[in-house]
Structure formats: C-alpha cells, structure tokens
C-alpha cells in the first residue's frame, strides 16, 4: 500500500560535509514500528546509503559505521548525513516503511538534491 512521503527539494551540505533534512510521512494509520532508508540516485544508479528501523518512542539506530544519524518526532524523521564530499552530490531519496502493525505501507519521497562543495585548501603561508 502506498503512502505519501515529503522531503525538501534541495539541501546544501555545510563546509564539514554534513547535510540534514526532514523526511515526513503521512501515516495512513497507527504505526509502532517504522523503517527509514536513504537511497542515493546518481547517473541512473540507485544505492542504499543507510537504513534504520525504530519503534515509536525510540531513537533511530543506524549501524555503528553508518554515515547517517537521525531523530524521530511523530511522523517526521530528521536525517543527517555526514562525511560528504563533492563527488557525493546527488539525489538522496527517503523511503519509509510502516512495518507494524499490519497492513504494510511503503512510501518514497521525490528526493532531496544534496550539493556538496569541497572546501578550498588553505593557501600555504610563507
């Protein structure tokens, strides 16, 4: 079953290569367990960046080596992606799945274009 997911169209990563955006879903019913996946689309290739399953009332827990962190509040998930470089510029898509209770719902956002600009190296000082 389909579900509407909203996310910002464009986000600019900061100078430390960190980008944050909100992924909001329109829950069609009660949801106590939610899975959030961030996908990156570039050159028609789609790769999974990170994923987390959380039970309502709990923080999102990504894998220890994940570049993502996040918090949840109601039907909103605040996602932060770290360690980005210019080559990581691309469309980052938020996918939300309502895992429990049934029925299963899934929604995919239109994507957030994240622009990453590598900082200029400091000029050597004489």
């Amino acid at each position: 079953k389909a579900m509407h997911v909203a996310q910002p169209a464009v986000v600019l990563a900061n100078s430390r290569g960190t980008a944050s955006f909100v992924c909001e879903y329109a829950s069609p019913g009660k949801a106590t367990e939610v899975r959030v996946t961030v996908l990156r689309q570039a050159d028609s290739q789609v790769t999974e960046v990170c994923a987390a399953t959380y039970m309502m009332g709990n923080e999102l827990t990504f894998l220890d080596d994940s570049i993502c962190t996040g918090t949840s509040s109601g039907n909103q998930v605040n996602l932060t992606i770290q360690g980005l470089r210019a080559m990581d510029t691309g469309l980052y898509i938020c996918k939300v799945e309502l895992m429990y209770p049934p029925p299963y719902y899934m929604g995919i956002g239109n994507g957030t274009q994240i622009y990453v600009i590598d900082p200029e190296p400091c000029p050597d000082s004489d």
């Epitope: 009660k30 106590t32 399953t53 039970m55 309502m56 209770p101 049934p102």
Partner: antibody, heavy 119, light 113 residues
C-alpha cells in the same frame, strides 16, 4: 487457543532483581508484539513497554526505562521482563499482554505475576 | 503522554439498570489518516486480568455481550451497559491505543446493589 502462561509469585528483598516469564502458545510467537503492564494493588494499569519477538526491538514507557528490560527467547516462544533495583514501589502484579491479530490492541493477557518487595 | 480521565470513579446500580461511564483523553485519539478512534475499553473482574471489551471506540470484541456499547470520538468516549447483570461487577478501564506510551484511565468501579 491463545494462551500466555506467566511465572509464579515472587518475594524479593529491596535492591534485588527479578526476572519473570511469559510463555506463549496457540499462535505464531514472532508475529505479534508482546506488551507488559503493571498494576499496583488497588490501582490502575500502567504500560511498561512492548517488544517485537521477531527481532527483539523494544519500546519503553519513559517511566520504566532503566527499571525494566524486555527480552524474548524465540526458540521457546517465551517473553521475559527483568526488573532491577527493586523497591517497595515495584510491588505489584505484572501482566504480559499480546497484541491482537485483527486490531492490534491488547486482547490476550497472562494471568499475572505478583511481585512483593519486602525486607 | 496522553492523559486518560475516567468518571465516575465508582457507581452502584441495581441489576437491570442502564449504566454509562465516561472517558476523556487529553488529546484526540482520532487518526486523521484512517478516521479511526484508537480507544479501547477493558473489564477487570476481581482477581482476574483485564479483558478486552471494545476497541476502535465502538467495536465489540468477539464474544462480548451486546449490552456493552462503546461510543464517542476524538477526546470524549462513553461505555454504556444497557441492562446491568450481576456478573458485570468489575472495574472498567479505558486505554489510549493511539500510540506509545499507551495510557489507561483510573478506572470506574461498578458495584451491584
């Protein structure tokens, strides 16, 4: 027929811990959340938390975080709740209650485990 | 957390009487996504675990006598027993089933004259 068989009453000293069990039968254990509910003598009901028996993920009432720990053993279709650093405030009857199969509200309950904390 | 308030705390009636008890929630239990009210009613007889009577504010659980009726929407809910029987002696609890943490009302104790 769904059945939730809870462990027997316990008498423990202040500061101790207790681990109670809830053995499920009559349904696929991993398909439905298991909730735990506290009822102090003559009082209302308090939801402690819930656990997904499939992967062991749990959610707690903030009031019981650090007090209760929920776990499951899929092989024996048993849910457990451990209570630590017990005080007289923890003296109560504790129920396990399964999410229902149609409406996912607590519709099957164990008979309760009575915990008395006394020196 | 959603606070559930029940009234009256107790009432004494005669067999055959009609009884109504109230439950109010501190925020709406009506889900905008599916227009369902996430409220349940439980009956707890002495020395027994709670038993589900009503879910979705108005749907009777299988096997529950039709003298039990749930009604209401949003924040105000009512449980009605059309003709009280001696076996209805119990405490009745409403429960927020909207989301975690689930919360219960303080209960209404029904006593029979």
């Amino acid at each position: 027929e769904v059945q939730l068989q809870q462990s027997g009453p316990v008498l423990v000293k202040p500061g101790a811990s207790v681990k109670m069990s809830c053995k499920a039968s009559g349904y696929t254990f991993t398909d439905y959340y298991m909730n735990w509910v506290k009822q102090s003598h003559g009082k209302s009901l308090e939801w402690i938390g819930a656990i997904n028996p499939d992967h062991g993920g749990s959610s707690y009432n903030q009031k019981f975080k650090g007090k209760a720990t929920l776990t499951v053993d899929k092989s024996s279709s048993t849910a457990y709740m451990e209570l630590n650093s017990l005080t007289s405030e923890d003296s109560a009857v504790y129920y396990c209650a399964r999410d229902g199969s149609i409406h996912y509200v607590m519709d099957d309950w164990g008979q309760g485990t009575s915990v008395t904390v006394s020196s | 957390d959603i606070v559930m308030s029940q009234s009256p705390s107790s009432l004494t009636v005669s067999a055959g009487d009609k009884v109504t008890m109230s439950c109010k929630s501190s925020q709406s239990l009506l889900h905008s996504g599916n227009q369902k009210n996430y409220l349940a009613w439980y009956q707890q007889k002495p020395w027994q675990p709670p038993k589900l009577l009503i879910y979705g504010a108005s749907t009777r659980e299988s096997g529950v006598p039709d003298r039990f009726t749930g009604s209401g929407s949003g924040t105000d809910f009512t449980l009605t027993i059309s003709s009280v029987q001696a076996e209805d002696l119990a405490v009745y609890y409403c429960q927020n089933d909207y989301g975690y943490p689930y919360t219960f009302g303080g209960g209404t104790k029904l006593e029979i004259k």
